[in-house]
């Protein structure tokens, strides 16, 4: 028997520095977690103690903090090289800055293989990119070899900016021939490493003949055996065992997100490459693990540029951006409109001639808007200003919901109206009319939504049975502010870009902004 230790991360989302327990900015260092310096300490400790170790990343290193905004992926290559990752799968967010934003900072600089079997380059891009990532890589480990085959969510064209010259194929269809290739090369220990979410990870384990282990990402799934060490609630045991169609027991793992945990899986193979046993657990990277001094020093050196960036002008406003709770928790506010417009703009993807865009709607809890921006400071807007408006380090995500769920969400928005509560929704691509004289749960009297399958966008009444795409904060997707119906009834959820980054990019693009209050949210006469 031969034992392999798989260390794995996924959805790190530019958390290079240690964070608080909820993966936001570290405030009290003695209670902070994660970060590459701490990760390096644990990885090195395991490498010294165990003979056959692989360090793998299942994608979405890109996007999530000011680190990515400023360094645009160079920080990912630099620190992943420093940690000596053995392989990485491409995630959807690796395409956020287009293909060029992947090629130059990461693909050309990484000293480890970057993998995806289901992304096929065509046209002029083929010669430029296809040698820079691979479908699989055979890695010598100790006296054996292990094949790693990569995959990426086929939804990436709807979630990011891969352009028109990359085709995202079905994961299972694309993986099978690559695994077969590895089999022709007599590689009999094969790990599928990828970024399509836990449901697809399980399907790959079930359907792709020859895959021994699946290491996944995208869905931020937390698996744990025993008593979990922090706030995350396990979605199942670690590893999650799937019985494949050909009768094998295939371990599937994921390690939550944001570098808070290091996945730790021990696999025992027999001499024919069959998995005999698998066990492990994610390791919580808390303050009991010291930060490596040399990596920490490097982080501090890179940090300097971030502090300078925070105070630079992104663009100008010529109007007061009303982000006060007195406005945004009671009525349509222009800060809410600005943020929603930025959220939609960030999700412009012309992937189908029938649609002007794949999504037209935005909802945003008014309680998530934490500050106004005064235009009387020469109109200047900085990252620092936006960090006061959106201080929680969240993301603006894409969900699919039935019309009936949206209707419930808008009823919840005003179910206790008047108490300055955070659930009051700001909107984009939606016209809503409330009648507050009616009883809670029956106050939405009109709800029109902007069409997507149209050449000239116009507002049509919401259909209860239709499925709609909506951009919203991850806080709402996770049922925050009492929006349990969203969490319980959503049909799909893909995590998006960092909230501040979305708004800052929009402001930089527009240069000068003047959002208005324009009748997106109305109250019927006599009720307000």
């Amino acid at each position: 028997a031969w034992e392999l230790t798989i260390l794995h991360t996924n959805d790190v989302h530019s958390r290079l520095e240690q964070t608080s327990e909820d993966s936001s900015k570290c405030v009290n260092a003695s209670r902070c977690m994660g970060g590459v310096a701490r990760l390096f300490t644990k990885v090195q400790q395991i490498r010294r103690a165990e003979p056959n170790v692989l360090l793998l990343d299942a994608g979405d290193q890109y996007q999530g903090t000011i680190w990515f905004t400023v360094y645009k992926g160079a920080e990912v290559a630099h620190f992943m090289n420093a940690l000596r990752y053995d392989a990485m799968a491409l995630g959807n967010h690796e395409f956020d800055n287009g293909v060029e934003g992947l090629i130059e900072p990461l693909l050309k600089e990484a000293k480890f293989p970057i993998l995806s079997a289901n992304i096929k380059a065509k046209g002029p891009l083929a010669s430029q990119i296809s040698g820079l990532y691979l479908p699989y890589k055979v890695l010598p480990v100790g006296d054996e070899v292990v094949g790693i085959v990569g995959y990426t969510s086929k939804e990436t064209p709807f979630l990011s900016n891969p352009g028109t010259n990359l085709v995202f194929e079905d994961e299972i269809t694309a993986l099978q021939p690559e695994v077969d290739k590895l089999k022709t090369l007599n590689v009999n220990k094969i790990i599928a490493l990828g970024h399509s979410g836990f449901e697809m990870d399980k399907l790959i384990a079930q359907k792709v003949r020859g895959v021994d282990v699946v290491v996944g990402g995208h869905s931020n799934t937390f698996l744990y055996t025993g008593n979990p060490p922090s706030k995350e609630v396990p979605a199942g045991k670690y590893p999650f065992i799937v019985t494949s169609d050909d009768g094998r027991k295939v371990p599937v793992v994921q390690a939550y997100a944001f570098g808070k945990y290091l996945g730790y899986l021990k696999i025992e193979f027999d001499e024919r490459g069959n998995v005999i046993s698998s066990h492990g657990n994610p390791i919580l990277l808390n303050s009991s693990i010291p930060e490596d001094p040399s990596i920490k020093a490097d982080i501090n050196k890179w940090r300097i540029k971030l502090d300078n960036y925070s105070t630079q002008e992104l663009g100008k406003t010529i109007v007061y951006l009303d982000g006060s709770s007195q406005s945004c928790r009671f009525r349509e506010c222009n800060m809410g409109n600005l943020i929603c417009d930025a959220m939609i703009n960030n999700n412009l993807r012309h992937t189908d001639e029938m649609f002007w865009n794949h999504v037209s709607m935005c909802i945003l809890n008014g309680g998530g808007i934490r500050s106004p921006i005064d235009e009387r400071n020469n109109g200047t807007i900085t990252w620092e200003n936006l960090a006061a408006v959106l201080p929680f380090g969240g993301t603006f995500d894409l969900v699919q919901l039935k019309g009936s769920t949206l209707k419930k969400a808008f009823e919840h928005s005003v179910h206790r109206y008047g108490q300055s509560t955070g659930e009051f929704l700001q909107v984009g691509g939606i016209h809503v009319v409330y009648d507050l004289s009616r009883k809670p749960g029956d106050r939405v009297v009109k709800l029109d939504v902007l069409c997507t399958k149209c050449r000239v966008p116009s507002y049509d009444p919401l259909k209860m049975d239709e499925v709609y795409k909506v951009i919203l904060p991850n806080f709402l997707a996770n049922g925050g502010d009492g929006f349990q119906m969203i969490k319980d009834e959503l049909l799909r959820h893909d995590s998006g870009d960092q909230d501040i980054n979305v708004v800052s990019t929009y402001i930089s693009k527009m240069k000068v902004i003047y959002p208005a209050v324009e009748g997106r949210i109305k109250f019927s006469t006599g009720s307000h």
Partner: antibody, heavy 117, light 107 residues
């Protein structure tokens, strides 16, 4: 330093079997890599014949499948080629090499085998 | 099987010149491609792996490029020791196949 050395008869009669030995020094053939036979015909054309892996599995070129066998003796750190039913078309310089899923980094110096009556 | 086609079959050049050899694969092989040099009466020496990575001790005047189905080996400022036969080879699954070779001769 890793070295590979081919040995065997330089002349084989048609219809007989060709047998060659590759002796490896500086690296154990049970460690990690694949151990290949490659031949080069008089016109310089190269053909990969097959390999034996560190864990004793074989992979042969389909064009030779019914005639070829690659085995090993781990105690001597050697691996062997046997090619049955040879014809004059099998006249070539035979090389052993280390590689497999990656390119052939280490080669023997080659041994010329002529198939002739 | 994946066929590897090399061009030109032979090439005459002078010391100091720059030459490029092309290798075409019959199917997409990503960057699972190697280049070798063979001198008269000797075995092959690995020059480039993964289409572009120079082997250890290989002079920087050699460079590999390309991916998918089209690959190139470029030799800048030819030196007397560069003359010989060059081969490409894919290792994207088995059977591994070689190009027919390009004989680089002194003009």
């Amino acid at each position: 330093d890793i070295q590979l050395q081919e040995s065997g008869p330089g002349l084989v009669k048609p219809s007989q079997s060709l047998s060659l030995t590759c002796s490896v020094t500086g690296y154990s053939i049970t460690s990690r890599y694949y151990w290949n036979w490659i031949r080069q015909f008089p016109g310089n054309k190269l053909e990969w014949m097959g390999y034996i892996t560190y864990d004793d599995n074989n992979n042969y070129n389909p064009s030779l499948k019914n005639r070829i066998s690659i085995t090993r003796d781990t105690s001597k750190n050697q691996f062997f080629l046997k090619l049955n039913s040879v014809t004059p078309e099998d006249t070539a310089t035979y090389y052993c090499a280390r590689g497999g899923w990656d390119p052939f980094l280490y080669w023997g110096q080659g041994t010329l085998v002529t198939v002739s009556a | 099987d994946i066929q590897m086609t090399q061009s030109p079959a032979s090439l005459s050049a002078s010391v100091g010149e720059t030459v490029t050899i092309t290798c075409r694969a019959s199917d997409n092989i990503y960057s699972y491609l190697a280049w070798y040099q063979q001198k008269q009466g000797k075995s092959l020496q690995l020059l480039v792996d993964s289409a572009k990575n120079l082997g250890e001790g290989v002079p920087s005047r050699f460079s590999g490029s390309g991916s998918g189905t089209q690959f190139y080996l470029k030799i800048n400022s030819l030196q007397p020791e560069d003359f010989g036969v060059y081969y490409c080879q894919h290792y994207y699954g088995t059977p591994f196949t070689f190009g027919g070779g390009t004989k680089l001769e002194l003009k």
